[in-house]
């Protein structure tokens, strides 16, 4: 079957796989006149890899809490047994009622865009529900994900999130919208309002049009022992143990303390949804306790003291002292001052010596004072804040915060590439390619100090020499290396990087990028001498910029062959001279040749070679450049992209036969010598014809 080039270009030629995994087809190329020999197009078929999703794809979350995704929720696998690290989820549509984030990253950062199955297995992918202002009983969120692992086809997945007060939540013991307890002065009365006790989330399970005729019935199952509950000034008792959410909302529920001490009080209750006029409805219910704290009327509330942030390295443990948490309270013992964790950061947890390994959520000032309370930095090295509430058991809780700054255990200065200085400029800005500090995350606040300066230049900020600079200045392109001495093609300097109390040193290498145009073209014929001219090496731009004649010094190479100066005319004595130095002018005059040698000790065939040159010009630093080229056995039928000054001996003999023709002109830089241009006049006339005509 015949296929045209335009069909190929148009993507109309398809390969359909059938049979074995390895195979292909033979083809010939033809332009209508000439036909190439046969070619073989190899095709390797891959077994189709299929991705599959297991797991419930549903996540139940307690209101206002953080829940990790687990393998029970989301478990991807592939028919090829792909490493979980390579099973990538992309978040196509993020959650609406909360956010998705990575446990090891700053939880205040942007929303997660992608994550791997391995991270799910590690419990590092977290869903955090954000409490809305309006009460609800059950809310539903969805995450749209795309699972991919090339070469398999992507798979779309939807993760359903159910946020429900029905769930048993260790971090939220109440099933009600609010059950915060009450503070009442000794012997006095206090109103229990919806700020303290609110079951309107039970009502939220009823569609809003019918909600006004529904209510929540509270039945007191254990009455306060040191006071009395009143509804609209009517006492509640065993014979009348009920009150309604609507009465709570109207401010009709009151607790009256009977006096005689400041012991704790409270009541137990059952709450359930009721329909219009108390009819039965299949709504939620809960049994809970409401705490009432009686405080001494004369008591002075505790005064929190200023807190110093706790600083410790990642992976370590540090005691919390009075510098971090302390209060002034003349009428409370340290053991009576209680702290409760309201919200913990994700960079570690608090633990009590002798209190087990797990995190603690309650502790006293006595625990702090005795050094029993410690922070364990098991998360990433980010700053975090504990939101605490502190109370002496007699005053309303006061909010407090404890800042924890996790320092990296070590930092690394990443040097991705040496600093390249353009030759004609002699200066260049440093970037993140040269200097970037990472710990377990990037350290954008890093600072650098020069501990060993460069030999041939200066570091500048704002045009002035400096020995200290910041990552921010690097990122803004403000830190510049400038050569001050034009005698070396490279330099280096050593810096000490400091990030969050940890340091590391690194050496930055500086190289000069030659302002040189190098073009080797296709392969060059072995055994031939070719002309080195501005089509191959050109420092003309450097000459213009420096108003000088650039000089080249051969540092190395070629391995097989040599650079030679060719005689100007046949009257010039001697053959070609070996060259170690030359100028741009020599290149422009066509005075240079490259004798391309054959690799010894092996069968003839393609090879690679190179020249390493140092390029000098007035007023700029030198630069090292290389000319890499491929070589092959001479092929008389092949058009070469450089001017040939001579061809191999064998080819010349062939060319001397009667049927060979004499060239009439010089091959241009891109012209070729299909037949060796060595005719009756011998080698010198070949040179004359090619170089000086």
């Amino acid at each position: 079957r015949t296929r045209s080039g335009s069909q190929l270009d148009g993507g109309l030629v398809l390969f359909s796989h059938r049979g074995t995994l390895d195979g292909g087809f033979r083809f010939r190329l033809s332009d209508g006149e000439h036909t190439s020999p046969g070619h073989f197009f190899r095709v390797t078929a891959q077994k189709q890899v299929l991705l599959s999703l297991k797991g419930s794809q549903t996540l139940t979350v307690c209101p206002g809490s953080v829940q990790p995704l687990s393998s029970q929720t989301l478990r991807a696998s592939s028919s090829a047994g792909t490493d979980p690290q390579l099973l990538l989820y992309r978040v196509v549509r993020g959650p609406q009622l909360g956010r998705l984030f990575h446990a090891q990253q700053d939880s205040t950062g942007e929303a997660l865009v992608n994550f791997t199955q391995a991270e799910v297995y590690a419990g590092n992918i977290l869903y955090e529900h954000e409490m809305p202002p309006e009460p609800f009983w059950e809310a539903h969120d969805t995450l749209e994900l795309q699972l991919s692992s090339p070469p398999a086809r992507d798979v779309a997945a939807t993760l359903a999130v159910a946020v429900s007060f029905e769930a048993a939540c260790p971090q939220r013991p109440s099933h009600l919208w609010k059950n915060k307890g009450l503070w009442v002065p000794e012997g006095q009365r206090a109103r229990i309002t919806v700020a303290a006790l609110d079951a309107s989330n039970l009502l939220a399970s009823v569609p809003s049009p019918q909600r006004s005729e529904h209510d929540v019935l509270f039945q007191v199952t254990q009455f306060p022992s040191r006071g009395q509950l009143l509804v609209s000034e009517e006492p509640l008792h065993a014979g009348q143990p009920h009150f309604l959410q609507s009465q709570l909302a109207a401010g009709q529920l009151v607790y009256a303390h009977g006096g005689g001490g400041t012991q704790q009080d409270g009541f137990h209750f059952r709450a359930h949804l009721q329909g219009p006029a108390g009819a039965s409805v299949a709504g939620p219910q809960t049994s809970e306790a409401f705490a009432i704290t009686v405080r001494d009327v004369n008591e002075r509330p505790p005064q929190p003291q200023a807190s110093v942030p706790l600083r410790l390295t990642r992976g370590s443990r540090a005691p919390i002292s009075r510098a971090q948490l302390s209060v002034v309270d003349p009428d409370s013992a340290p053991g009576e001052i209680e702290y409760e964790v309201q919200r913990a950061p994700h960079n570690g947890f608090l633990s009590l010596v002798g209190g087990g390994l797990g995190p603690v959520t309650r502790f006293t000032q006595a625990d702090v004072d005795s050094g029993r309370l410690a922070f364990v930095a098991n998360g990433s090295s980010v700053a975090g804040i504990f939101q605490l509430s502190m109370s002496d058991g007699a005053s309303p809780p006061l909010p407090m915060s404890l800042a924890v700054d996790i320092l990296p255990s070590a930092i690394e200065v990443q040097l991705r590439a040496p600093l390249e200085v353009p030759q004609a400029l002699g200066r260049s800005s440093l970037s993140q390619q040269q200097l970037r500090v990472v710990s377990d995350r990037e350290e954008p606040e890093a600072a650098y100090r020069l501990i060993q300066g460069p030999q041939y230049g200066h570091l500048l900020v704002g045009g002035r020499p400096t020995s200290a600079f910041s990552q921010f200045q690097i990122d803004q392109g403000e830190v510049v290396f400038a050569f001050t001495n034009s005698s070396s093609s490279h330099d280096h300097f050593r810096v000490l990087a400091l990030a969050r109390g940890v340091n590391a040193s690194a050496v930055v290498n500086v190289t000069v990028r030659a302002l040189l145009h190098v073009w080797a073209g296709g392969p060059w014929p072995q055994g031939a001498t070719l002309r080195l001219d501005p089509t191959v090496l050109d420092a003309g731009e450097l000459a213009n910029r420096t108003d000088s004649v650039p000089r080249f010094r051969l540092l190395e190479g070629p391995r097989h062959g040599r650079v030679v100066r060719v005689p100007r005319a046949r009257t010039e004595p001697g053959g070609s001279q070996l060259v170690e130095q030359f100028t741009q002018q020599d290149l422009e005059d066509g005075r240079l040749g490259l004798e391309v040698g054959r690799p010894e000790g092996r069968a003839p065939g393609p090879a690679g070679d190179s020249l390493t040159l140092e390029l000098w010009a007035q007023g700029v630093p030198p630069a090292v450049a290389s000319l890499d080229f491929a070589t092959e056995p001479y092929n008389a039928a092949r058009p070469y992209s450089v001017a040939l000054l001579s061809v191999p001996e064998a080819a010349r003999t062939e060319a001397g036969k009667p049927e060979s023709s004499t060239p009439t002109g010089e091959p241009g830089p891109m012209a070729s010598s299909p037949e060796p241009a060595v005719a009756k006049g011998g080698f010198l006339s070949f040179l004359e014809a090619n170089m000086f005509s």
Epitope: S212, E213, L217, V231, S232, E234, H242, L244, S246, Q247, Q252, R270, H272, L273, Q274, G275, P276, A277, G278, A279, S280, V281, A282, G283, P284, Q285
Partner: antibody, heavy 117, light 113 residues
């Protein structure tokens, strides 16, 4: 203490309307539903409907739908029950009852309405 | 509508003896969510309005003597007067307060033998 005081007995002609009142005292009027229950002579109890004094919302038994209207006056803590198109079988003692949940904890003394030509 | 039936229609019991009244609903009045039976018992003496004795099938109203007790679940309920007194002579009604229309049983008349 909680009291529900109803209006006095009435005699009505068939086809006429009647309006019985129920005045509440001793508690927060708007906190509790008022139901109306009737009892024909020598018969059992029959629930007619309820009114929420707070919102004015009502719910009537299907049997009385279209004939009964329950209203309230929060300024006097009084609930009214009007029954139209009276027939002889509407002769009964009409009770108002206070409820919080759906049981009736307090009752009025009852109003006898006699429908007779 | 939920239909309530009572048995017996009437009973005569000696003073100090136990009186048992049964009540049956045509459908369950148990709310499985809060595990409550929405059933109440009332006592009515001649010329008086009814008086609440029991609600939620077994919870005695304040001030009601403890000789009155309620039991049962779902559709079958019982009111027991453990030691009948002279003042207990009355008609006893059960009522479902599960859903509207709230309905009463036809009543059971209790007399002294």
């Amino acid at each position: 203490q909680v009291q529900l005081v109803q209006s006095g007995a009435e005699v009505k002609r068939p086809g006429a309307s009647m309006k019985v009142s129920c005045k509440a005292s001793g508690y927060t009027f708007t906190n509790y539903y008022i139901h109306w229950v009737r009892q024909a002579p020598g018969q059992g109890l029959e629930w007619m409907g309820w009114i929420n004094p707070n919102s004015g919302a009502t719910n009537y038994a299907q049997k009385f739908q279209g004939r009964v209207t329950m209203t309230r006056d929060t300024s006097t803590s009084t609930v009214y029950m009007e029954l139209s198109s009276l027939r002889s079988e509407d002769t009964a003692v009409y009770y108002c009852a206070k409820s919080w949940v759906s049981w009736f904890a307090s009752w009025g003394q009852g109003t006898l309405v006699t429908v007779s030509s | 509508d939920i239909v309530m039936t009572q048995s017996p229609d009437s009973l005569a019991v000696s003073l100090g003896e136990r009186a048992t009244i049964n009540c049956k609903s045509s459908q369950s009045v148990l709310n499985s969510k809060n595990n409550r039976n929405y059933l109440a018992w009332y006592q009515q003496k001649p010329g008086q309005p009814p008086k609440l004795l029991i609600y939620w099938a077994s919870t005695r109203e304040s001030g009601v003597p403890d000789r009155f007790s309620g039991s049962g679940s779902g559709t079958d309920f019982t009111l027991t007067i453990s030691g009948l007194q002279a003042e207990d002579v009355a008609v006893y009604y059960c009522q479902q307060h599960y859903s509207t229309p709230f309905t009463f049983g036809p009543g059971t008349k209790v007399d002294i033998k």
